[in-house]
Interface confidence: medium
């Protein structure tokens, strides 16, 4: 790899290994490796191994950091609002005497006007304005599923409030699903949480522009405060570039380990505790794939080069518009270890030890 | 600010401003600023402003990126398991004929053995091993609150499975609360989701080592598979360092804008679209606090300097054990804008535009 001057890859690896030596001791608050004089002979106790495996399983099940943003997330999102179907629509007829829930229906053709293709949708929020209330209530949100069934989406504990407040629910997956189906009326149900042993199943929360009992004055409520969907989507014409232009690659192990990428990428580095650090005191694991980030992130002068080709480079080389972009870790994962303090085995988890992907920042 | 050579702060700002010029156009997929020839005179339409405000409200309500990790998260966590109180304990007596729920009780003195102080707890997971099942069921987890009441914690949709599988619930806040109370028996309830209009409230899920109906063979179930709490905590002796040693500061606007920090920090930069970029085409906002990251992140050679003072520096200057640590954005926020394309006003959201804090990475 070369930037202005040739990079000494071996020196970089050595510096990374030495940094890890300090990092592990520092994370354990140890001034030096613990003495191994009292460590009992033989394998680790079964209970300790089970605990180590439990910790490792947790790590496998959930990555410590959010996934790197997909390419489309770099680009601007057009924001639109879709108001719920008017309360005078016949579709609300059969819902008006239900005390445990209120209903909000949306016409998917209105949604499709704003978001013609399901993958263009970046985020959808259901926004409801809750009126002032003196009671605490646990509420749930459901999605209309088939003719007469509802699918649970989420819940919220609503505490008393002196002023109207907006509630927001992330319904991205639901709206994307609607867009994958045909045009029609789809809806949400906002319900009291009914516990198996609870008696009071009435919804005490009032939502602006809607209410369990149909009122004559609903038509007068200002449209702005009626429940609506806030949609964020990549405009169609911008999305067509995404397919045609060179993709921003995820600078992760899948791509970087199998390519000859000269620019910023994650580089392979396995650390063997014995061989690389001369340590015998970490009993599990024997080593780990630490990896590291390396490669240039060119600064792009945009003043005299305002044309598509140069602008497309921003996404890859300087998405954060830094004055001096730098190749740094993006997704990191923790590392569980087993070591002894005197005769006592310990299982500890070290955060942010494994570099999974890099980015220019 | 100086590193080896003096930094020309004005040049850095200029480069950041120019990078932002390219970044905004690039995010909007524009080769050049849009023509303003057809823009109607007068203020923005009310509906467009309402939409812009809705988007801005969303941004205010939830930061786009996770909060920077607290200092304690840098250090290793000791992992321990606390098994639930044995099913033969009399406390289970009054729960055995309830078909909608199963109960798991824990002795807080066992938990306190592992975590003597509430703030030391980093994470607590309730782990249950679900036996194979051919039914789908929506389940809920509750925390024992006062003598006869239960507080809702979370839910899960369990799909059919051919093999036993572990379920994990994050119960950190609950366990921390228990640690803040006296010693005693505390518990969880694992229940069927009872909808306001549902008839079948029976829990069909079976959990290893526990079951709605008490069985004679429960004692034989291997302890490893009985429900347990997986605890991750900072050991007491390590925590005492946290109070005594120099804290790792959050390199955010609160700290950096009011200090003379020479090392990596977020630096103030307001961009006025008209003055700084010569742009009249962005109608809202008029400008924004872009900010930027600047300052050295010294590499620490740990080979011949294994002593506490140097190790403490890792946390601040090179927590990721990089071969060449770099001052980069940590928390970023989006920016909603209003601009015209021809006669049509558009509200768009640009991701990762405002730098709230920095880190050495």
């Amino acid at each position: 790899l070369s930037t202005c001057k040739t990079i000494d890859m071996e020196l970089v690896k050595r510096k990374r290994i030495e940094a890890i030596r300090g990092q592990i001791l520092s994370k354990l608050r140890l001034a030096s490796p613990p003495s191994q004089g009292e460590v009992p002979p033989g394998p680790l106790p079964e209970a300790v191994l089970a605990l180590y495996n439990s910790t490792r399983d947790r790590v496998a099940g959930e990555s410590a950091d959010p996934e790197p943003e997909p390419e489309a997330d770099y680009y601007a999102k057009e924001v639109t609002r879709v108001l719920m179907v008017d309360r005078n629509n016949a579709i609300y007829e059969k819902t008006k005497d239900i005390s445990h829930s209120i209903y909000m229906f949306f016409n998917t053709s209105d949604i499709r006007e704003a978001v013609p293709e399901p993958p263009l949708l970046s985020r959808a929020e259901l926004r409801l304005q809750r009126l002032k209330s003196s009671v605490e209530q646990h509420v749930e949100l459901y999605q209309k599923y088939s003719n007469n069934s509802w699918r649970y989406l989420g819940n919220r504990l609503l505490t008393p409030t002196d002023t109207p407040e907006w509630l927001s629910f992330d319904v991205t997956a639901v709206v994307r699903q609607w867009l994958n189906q045909g045009d029609g009326i789809q809806g949400f149900r906002f319900s009291a949480h009914c516990s198996c042993d609870s008696k009071d199943n009435k919804l005490h929360v009032e939502i602006n522009g809607i209410s369990p009992k149909r009122r004559g004055d609903l038509g007068t409520i200002h449209d702005m405060n009626r429940p609506f969907l806030l949609l964020m989507a990549t405009p169609l014409e911008r999305a067509q570039h995404l397919h045609s232009s060179r993709h921003r690659r995820a600078l992760d192990t899948n791509y970087c380990f199998s390519s000859t990428e000269k620019n910023c990428c994650v580089r392979q580095l396995y650390i063997d505790f014995r061989k690389d650090l001369g340590w015998k005191w970490i009993h599990e694991p024997k080593g780990y794939h630490a990896n590291f980030c390396l490669g240039p992130c060119p600064y792009i002068w945009s003043l005299d080069t305002q044309y598509s080709k140069v602008l497309a480079l921003y996404n890859q080389h300087n998405p954060g518009a830094s004055a001096s972009p730098c190749c740094v870790p993006q997704a990191l994962e923790p590392l569980p270890i087993v070591y002894y303090v005197g005769r006592k085995p310990k299982v500890e988890q070290l955060s942010n030890m494994i570099v999974r992907s890099c980015k220019c920042s | 600010l100086s590193t080896c050579k003096t930094i020309d702060m004005e040049l850095v700002k200029r480069k950041r401003i120019e990078a932002i010029r390219g970044q905004i156009l690039s995010k909007l997929r524009l080769a050049s600023p849009p023509s303003q020839g057809e823009v109607p005179p007068g203020p923005l339409p009310e509906a467009v402003l309402a939409l812009y405000n809705s988007t801005r409200d969303r941004v205010a309500g939830e930061s786009a990126d996770p909060e920077p990790e607290p200092e304690a998260d840098y250090y290793a966590k000791e992992v321990t398991r606390v098994l639930m109180v044995d099913r033969n304990n009399a406390i289970y007596e009054k729960t055995k004929d309830i078909s909608h729920s199963i109960y798991m009780f824990f002795n807080t003195s066992d938990i306190r053995e592992a975590v003597p102080e509430p703030p030391l707890l980093s994470r607590a997971e309730l782990r249950l091993q679900r036996l194979k099942s051919s039914v789908e069921q929506h389940v809920e987890l509750y925390q024992k609150y006062s003598n006869n009441s239960w507080r809702y914690l979370g839910n899960r949709l369990l799909t059919p499975t051919d093999t036993p599988e572990w379920l994990s619930f994050d119960v950190t806040a609950v366990v921390r609360q228990w640690l803040n109370q006296g010693d005693g028996i505390q518990g969880f309830r694992f229940s069927a989701h009872c909808s306001c209009d549902s008839k079948d409230n029976k829990l069909h899920v079976e959990i290893n080592g526990i079951s709605p109906k008490r069985r004679g063979d429960l004692g034989t179930i291997h302890d490893m598979n009985r429900p347990f709490l997986l605890l991750m905590a900072t050991p007491l002796e390590r925590a005492q360092h946290l109070h005594s040693s120099r804290h790792r500061r959050a390199l955010d606007t609160n700290y950096c804008f009011s200090s003379t920090e020479k090392n990596c920090c977020v630096r103030q930069l307001y961009i006025d679209f008209r003055k700084d970029l010569g742009w009249k085409w962005i109608h809202e906002p008029k400008g924004y606090h872009a900010n930027f990251c600047l300052g050295p992140c010294p590499y620490i050679w740990s080979l011949d300097t294994q002593y506490s003072k140097v190790l403490a520096l890792y946390n601040q200057h090179n927590p990721g054990a990089s071969a060449s640590p770099c001052c980069v954005p940590q928390a970023l926020e989006p920016l909603p804008i209003v601009y015209y394309v021809g006669r049509k006003p558009k509200v768009e959201q640009l991701s990762n535009m405002i730098v709230r804090s920095c880190k050495c990475s």
């Epitope: 179907v85 629509n89 016949a90 579709i91 229906f105 016409n107 998917t108 053709s109 499709r112 006007e113 013609p116 293709e117 399901p118 993958p119 263009l120 003719n147 867009l179 994958n180 189906q181 045909g182 045009d183 029609g184 009326i185 169609l236 014409e237 999305a239 067509q240 | -």
Partner: antibody, heavy 120, light 111 residues
């Protein structure tokens, strides 16, 4: 605005056919599209629809699994690939522009149609 | 058998008013889904008359109007003319099928 179908003709049962529809006079890449057929002397039957970018397609139960609808926005062309044809697929096939972008909410412009005859 | 039911034929004299009906169910018309009406003159392709239940397509004379009550939709033609002799189809999205459906069609004869 113009929609011109082509590719119809005589085909044996079990055979395949690919219909095309050339679109002009509107922004094809922003429009949902549909195919509708009409058997001789019978009523209209909706066959399939596609969204503007082609990421979602919808089919009538009578053709599901035998028919694939696709589009090439660069060429402003819509396609209907028909396999395992049966005699009951004999009809005039119309290409139509969707009222909204799914093609499932009605059609506002129609082509003149192309005749497909399935017979041995 | 169509999901949307129409009378197979109707007739009327010039100048008269005729109403063509289309009966559906809660999974289509009654579900609040947009209904369209199409006219097909003999030997030609269908043409959109009405969309979204009661909106006239461009170029359609105001003699044509649409309405809906519950699951019943209607197309009304006032001041019937000879050139209105055609087949008329209703069409709507059906959520139980996740498809678009047409009525069987009504053949209107102008006497």
């Amino acid at each position: 605005l113009q929609l011109v179908e082509s590719g119809g003709g005589l085909v044996q049962p079990g055979g395949s056919l690919r219909l095309s529809c050339a679109a002009s006079g509107f922004t094809f890449s922003r429009s949902g599209m549909a195919w509708v057929r009409q058997a001789p002397g019978k009523g209209l039957e909706w066959v399939s629809a596609i969204t503007p970018g082609g990421t979602a397609t919808y089919y009538a139960n009578s053709v599901k699994g035998r028919v694939t609808m696709s589009r090439d926005n660069a060429k402003n062309t819509l396609y209907l690939q028909m396999n395992s044809l049966k005699s009951e697929d004999t009809a005039v096939y119309y290409c139509a522009k969707g009222l909204v972008s799914s093609g499932l909410n009605g059609m506002d412009y129609w082509g003149k149609g192309t005749l497909v005859t399935v017979s041995s | 058998q169509s999901v949307l039911t129409q009378l197979s034929s109707m007739s009327g004299s010039p100048g008269q008013t005729v109403t063509i009906t289309c009966t559906g169910s809660s999974s289509n018309i009654g579900g609040g889904y947009y209904l369209s009406w199409y006219q097909q003159l003999p030997g030609t392709a269908p043409k959109l008359l009405i969309y979204n239940t009661n909106n006239r397509a461009s170029g359609v004379p105001n003699r044509f109007s649409g309405s809906k009550t519950g699951s019943l939709a209607s197309l009304t033609i006032t001041g019937l003319q000879a050139e209105d002799e055609a087949d008329y189809y209703c069409g709507c999205y059906d959520d139980s099928l996740n498809t678009y459906v047409f009525g069987g069609g009504t053949k209107l004869t102008v006497l």
